[in-house]
């Protein structure tokens, strides 16, 4: 997992046209931030959504020679003190001299010096800097020793998750070595690594390391702006856990973030042990994610079990796509804290109705308007089968309110059923007392006539599944449906002539391909006569139109041929293309007509077995 070297190797490949030992770096436009080029960033030409420009520099350890291409020469080597000058960390060099550290790092030994760049010192709080400069023999020396290890450690030796004792009181240095090649020390990024010295190595870092003696718990307890979070963490028994050893990342909502919550939401969550613990754990990662490690969106699992997406937009960290981090990289002895101005509420702490997204607002508005929201009690468990907004036509919305309420009741189940609990043939009962059938296909899950879209969620008191269409529970059997529709009278008479009517009246699961009367218009009277005269042949043909099992066109993977075996024994080929069902390559005029014992697909030709 030597990611730094892998990324460096990629940068070398990108730079090899420029000569030996040349590395391609990407610099974020308008900043001094430079990164060795990852494959992803190279092609995206951006980092954190900011445009980058490509620079070609000598790879670490090499230098240019006049009149020669690339970087053919090895950089001069010196002791650690001299190397600080070679890498341009002249402020750190000057401070090393002033604090009498120079003698130590010029002499024999083997040291790793995480040397803050000149810019890093300039960015240090002026009061802290003055304090160090006014006590060079103790405070400054201690601060510099806290940037050092008494052993040469190249980036390949700096493994993710290591805690290395520094040369000041063995205070731990948190090492993170990320897959994108970023290496951080207490969240300071190594911006110029592996400058080898005769007595060790120098890594230039982008900030001055401040001493960290406290845990995340200590910080929360001391920080006034986290009093609401502190109270919530105590209530949910999470605070103590943040005092233990670990490599945590805490997204800590400030008091302002808690004030933004709608009235009653926090009270409800904090009054519920399970929900409050979920809320708190959703703000914690079990891995240490420094801001400098984030170069694009990545998904991380929280202690609560669900994931959050951490990304970046310029200098800002984003959480679930939103800029919300006020202060980043507060390093403690068991992790890092980022202060955020929003409370992150996991699904597991939400009421079922709160799980609905922007695409289900019509459904949730109707649930509220028609008085169904009050039926969803916090202590009960429900499942919402929420159709997307565009499933509701103007005709549906202008229906009689009582009728609309009945339709909506068909979209609320009496129990909590998660996506992984659904199975083919399952019967689900709605709060209106209707029974809905579940059909599970290779790439789709459908309930009655409507199939699910991605986005199922589970909340504190229920689950929500997203549907493409309004669910219409079947009322009539296959036979009743054929009788009711005049288009199918010819096929129905053939069914009766073949003595197969009974088959369509009994309970079961069938798929029936029904030719309209038009399908028979082109037939000669002789062909029709043959059909009726030879009962065996007729039965054969009719049974070819019937398949065991309910196969909904919308349940098929688009563009893929599905081979089904008919009751007659021969195969029939179905394919869904552009929302149209093809039956043996013939376009179905109408599909997915649901019945209590199956589904009808309408065709405009009589089908013959091969």
């Amino acid at each position: 997992n030597n990611h730094y070297d892998k990324i460096l190797a990629h940068s070398r490949i990108r730079g090899r046209d420029q000569g030996p030992n040349v590395c391609a770096l990407q610099q974020i436009l308008g900043t001094k931030k430079k990164y060795f080029s990852t494959c992803k960033n190279w092609y995206k030409k951006s980092i954190c959504g900011q445009k980058t420009t490509v620079l070609y520099e000598c790879c670490p350890g090499y230098m240019r020679m006049e009149g020669m291409k690339g970087c053919p020469a090895v950089l001069p080597i010196d002791h650690v003190y001299g190397t600080l000058g070679i890498v341009g960390a002249t402020t750190t060099q000057r401070y090393s001299d002033a604090s009498k550290l120079r003698e130590e790092i010029e002499g024999k030994g083997s040291f790793t010096y995480f040397a803050p760049s000149n810019e890093a010192w300039d960015n240090l709080d002026s009061d802290i800097r003055r304090g160090l400069e006014s006590n060079v023999n103790v405070e400054l020396l201690n601060a510099l020793h806290s940037h050092m290890i008494n052993k040469r450690m190249l980036t390949k030796d700096l493994k993710n998750g290591m805690i290395i004792p520094s040369m000041y009181n063995n205070l731990g240095l948190f090492i993170n070595h990320y897959p994108n090649g970023v290496v951080t020390v207490n969240c300071a990024r190594i911006i110029h690594g592996n400058q080898i010295a005769t007595n060790g190595v120098v890594h230039v870092i982008d900030r001055v390391l401040t001493q960290i003696g406290t845990s995340i718990q200590d910080f929360i307890e001391a920080e006034d702006d986290l009093s609401s979070f502190r109270a919530a963490a105590i209530t949910s028994d999470i605070l103590e856990a943040l005092g233990r050893d670990g490599h945590f990342t805490l997204f800590a909502p400030t008091n302002e973030a808690f004030e933004k919550l709608p009235r009653g939401v926090l009270e409800r969550i904090m009054g519920d042990k399970v929900a409050s613990e979920a809320l708190m754990k959703y703000h914690i990662l079990n891995t240490l994610q420094c801001s400098e490690s984030i170069m694009g969106g990545a998904v991380f699992e929280t202690l609560e079990g669900n994931t959050i997406e951490i990304g970046c937009d310029g200098d800002s960290i984003t959480v679930n796509g939103i800029k919300m981090v006020n202060k980043k990289d507060i390093v403690t002895n068991n992790g890092v804290i980022h202060l955020i101005d929003q409370v992150l509420i996991p699904d597991s702490a939400k009421q079922v109705i709160e799980l609905a997204g922007k695409q289900q607002t019509t459904f949730t508005d109707l649930v509220a308007q028609l008085g169904l929201a009050s039926a969803l009690r916090p202590d009960g468990e429900y499942t919402l089968l929420a159709p997307v907004n565009n499933a509701f036509s103007d005709d549906t919305l202008s229906m009689d309110q009582r009728l609309l309420k009945l339709i909506l009741q068909n979209h609320i189940l009496k129990v909590k059923v998660g996506l992984n609990e659904l199975y083919n043939g399952q019967i689900l009962e709605t709060i209106g007392g209707k029974q809905l059938r579940v059909f599970v296909y290779r790439t789709a899950v459908c309930i009655e006539n409507s199939c699910m879209e991605k986005g199922s969620k589970q909340g504190r008191n229920g689950a929500i599944h997203i549907f493409r269409e309004i669910i219409k529970p079947a009322e009539k059997s296959l036979h009743e449906k054929l009788k009711q529709d005049k288009r199918f009278s010819t096929f129905l008479s053939l069914l009766e002539a073949a003595d197969l009517k009974e088959l369509l009246t009994q309970p079961g699961d069938w798929t029936l391909f029904v030719p309209t009367n038009d399908a028979f218009k082109g037939m000669t009277s002789e062909e029709k006569e043959i059909l009726i005269r030879d009962k065996n042949a007729l039965q054969n043909i009719i049974l070819y139109h019937l398949t065991p099992g309910v196969f909904i066109g919308k349940g098929f993977e688009p563009g893929v041929t599905n081979i089904l075996k008919t009751t007659q024994g021969s195969k029939i080929f179905l394919k869904e293309v552009n929302d149209t069902l093809l039956v043996n390559e013939l376009k179905s005029k109408e599909s997915d007509i649901m019945t209590t014992n199956g589904v009808i697909h309408v065709v405009d030709k009589l089908l013959y077995p091969a």
């Epitope: 090499y62 130590e104 024999k108 083997s110 008494n150 004792p165 040369m167 080898i196």
Partner: antibody, heavy 116, light 111 residues
Framework: QVQLQQPGSELVKPGASVKLSCKAS????????MHWVKQSPGQGLEWIGE????????NYNEKFKTKATLTVDKSSSTAYMQLNSLTSEDSAVYYC?????????WGQGTLVTVSA | NIVLTQSPASLAVSLGQRATISCSAS??????????IHWFQQKPGQPPKLLIY???YLESGVPARFSGSGSRTDFTLTIDPVEADDAATYYC?????????FGGGAKLEIK
């Protein structure tokens, strides 16, 4: 100047243990790792392991993990290596070496003889 | 573990002549433009003495007759001209990868 003092020799019986010492002077003991190297009679050199005197952290060569135990006493700036279950194979000169780039400072070595 | 193979195992060189000892590593000992190979001299009854560090840098107090060269896997220690006091065993040593390892040694005899 940097000095690493080791006793000249130790005679030990097979199956017994021995604790070798290495007293450091002339530098800040906790600022440098201490390494131990074995040299069998007429043989080459083998790295045994290292210890960080500031916190007692150790790294061992797999080969010596069960044979050697490294410790330090900061108050006396002394590093120790205990060798257990000694056999004739363990008869050798053992050096302590300060952890510089390139091992610049060596003790004089302790000759351990395992004999009944 | 990185294996260091020294050759020849022993050599006899006339006073004033050049002695060359090779050290071959089983894998590269280079990192960031530096070779983590070091050369020692050892005389009977004494601990090894550092001559050359990081493949080519002369340790302070060591005569300039000693020099080191090479990169990646192939390294050379050269003594030119050889003096009577140079009779000893010479070892190469790598610390690019843990565990650090030593070569088998090359015994130099002065004719």
């Amino acid at each position: 100047q940097v000095q690493l003092q080791q006793p000249g020799s130790e005679l030990v019986k097979p199956g017994a243990s021995v604790k070798l010492s290495c007293k450091a002077s002339g530098y800040t003991f906790t600022s440098y790792w201490m390494h131990w190297v074995k040299q069998s009679p007429g043989q080459g050199l083998e790295w045994i392991g290292e210890i960080n005197p500031s916190n007692g952290r150790t790294n061992y060569n797999e080969k010596f993990k069960t044979k050697a135990t490294l410790t330090v006493d900061k108050s006396s700036s002394t590093a120790y290596m205990q060798l257990n279950s000694l056999t004739s194979e363990d008869s050798a000169v053992y050096y302590c070496v300060r952890g510089d780039e390139g091992f610049a400072y060596w003790g004089q070595g302790t000759l351990v003889t395992v004999s009944a | 573990n990185i294996v260091l193979t020294q050759s020849p195992a022993s050599l006899a060189v006339s006073l004033g002549q050049r002695a060359t000892i090779s050290c071959s590593a089983s894998e590269s000992v280079d990192s960031y433009g530096r070779s983590f190979i070091h050369w020692f001299q050892q005389k009977p009854g004494q601990p090894p003495k550092l001559l050359i560090y990081l493949a080519s840098y002369l340790e302070s107090g060591v005569p300039a007759r000693f020099s080191g060269s090479g990169s990646r896997t192939d390294f050379t220690l050269t003594i030119d001209p050889v003096e009577a006091d140079d009779a000893a065993t010479y070892y190469c040593h790598q610390n690019n990868e843990d565990p650090p390892t030593f070569g088998g040694g090359a015994k130099l005899e002065i004719k």
